[in-house]
């Protein structure tokens, strides 16, 4: 397993719609074929899992159905963009990516990218 | 190194409107927040909300919301704080700091006198 | 929001004394979103801790900061007549983010 640097902003503000983008750019020290790139969210020293995708290079980053991620990859830039954020899921989310193929395999994991959240006011009761 | 430039002091009348800027340098913009900070005098730090240089994104306090806006020049990597309708209250130093998420690098201060 | 409450609000204390300054929140806090800062007279603030322990770059081992959930603590082991100063504690865990009404520390 080598070590490979991975690059994310410190801090990024969410959409007032729960929708947060961000570029993950990594250092490719060789010319990976596959990669897999995975979301993990830190929050109060827990680490969960929040997505991941294993793409192709050149091909459209595929998360499962029910994921709340989806990405476009160029190069070694890859724009993850997280959706349905509440302000409970304030946290640090942290880029990983490992080059699959071919060998030798690579991992690098970014510093976290700080996200905050807030909930929409709610809307005054209308009547109709 | 990281730098934050703040522009010079201003005397409005009430009513008027003022808008600061900060110039970052030493960093990638981008990758951080501007958060606006101000301090009455003899009094303590008032967090006025904040902006994410990566998106535009802001959040203010409750209590400036309608009067404030944050915006940012990515281009000259320059952050900017209007802040309209003033009052005597308004009266203060007005500072930038970086949000890394913490406030790691501050502007000089720049003081904002109401007064008719 | 959570609100954030400093004790005391001035420390008389001589040069060479032990200051423990302490800072409440209303609600339970991360301790990786609780900073503190210094203020000196006609200067901006300076960030000292962050994440509650870790001190910033080029800060004294002098300063030191603990605690978490709501109690946090701010200690200078031995007064250097340059702490003489205001400090602050703030959080920037959900928003609103919010600062202590700040501790003056001064000569006694």
């Known amino acids: 397993c080598k070590a490979m640097h991975v690059a994310q902003p410190a801090v990024v503000l969410a959409s007032s719609r729960g929708i947060a983008s961000f570029v993950c750019e990594y250092a490719s020290p060789g010319k990976a074929t596959e990669v897999r790139v995975t979301v993990l969210r830190q929050a109060d020293s827990q680490v969960t899992e929040v997505c991941a995708a294993t793409y192709m290079m050149g091909n459209e980053l595929t998360f499962l159905d029910d994921s709340i991620c989806t990405g476009t990859s160029s190069g070694n830039q890859v724009n993850l963009t997280i959706q349905g954020l509440r302000a409970m899921d304030t946290g640090l989310y942290i880029c990983k990516v490992e080059l699959m193929y071919p060998p030798p395999y690579y991992l690098g994991i970014g510093n976290g990218t700080q996200i905050y959240v807030i909930d929409p006011e709610p809307c005054p009761d209308s009547d109709f | 190194q990281v730098q934050l430039v703040q522009s010079g002091a201003e005397v409005k009348k009430p009513g008027a409107s003022v808008k600061v800027s900060c110039k970052a340098s030493g960093y990638t913009f981008t990758s951080y927040g501007i958060s606006w900070v101000r301090q009455a005098p003899g009094q303590g730090l008032e967090w006025m909300g904040w902006i994410s240089a990566y998106n535009g994104n802001t959040n203010y306090a409750q209590k400036l919301q309608g009067r404030v806006t944050m915006t940012t020049d990515t281009s000259t990597s320059t952050a900017y704080m209007e802040l309209r309708s003033l009052r005597s209250d308004d009266t203060a130093v007005y500072y930038c700091?970086?949000?890394?998420?913490?406030?790691?690098?501050w502007g000089q201060g720049t003081l904002v006198t109401v007064s008719s | 929001e959570i609100v954030m409450t400093q004790s005391p609000a001035t420390l008389s204390l001589s040069p060479g004394k032990r200051a423990t300054l302490s800072c409440r929140a209303s609600q339970s806090v991360s301790s990786s979103y609780l900073s503190w800062y210094q203020q000196k007279p006609g200067q901006a603030p300076r960030l000292l801790i962050y994440?509650?322990?870790t001190r910033a770059t080029g800060i004294p081992a002098r300063f030191s900061g603990s605690g978490s959930g709501t109690n946090f603590t701010l200690t200078i082991s031995s007064l250097q007549p340059e702490d003489f100063a205001v400090y602050y504690c703030?959080?920037?865990?959900?928003?609103?983010?919010?600062f202590g009404q700040g501790t003056k520390v001064e000569f006694k």
């Open positions: 994440g509650a322990s």
């Open positions: 703030q959080h920037v865990y959900h928003l609103p983010w919010t």
């Open positions: 700091a970086r949000v890394g998420p913490h406030f790691d690098y």
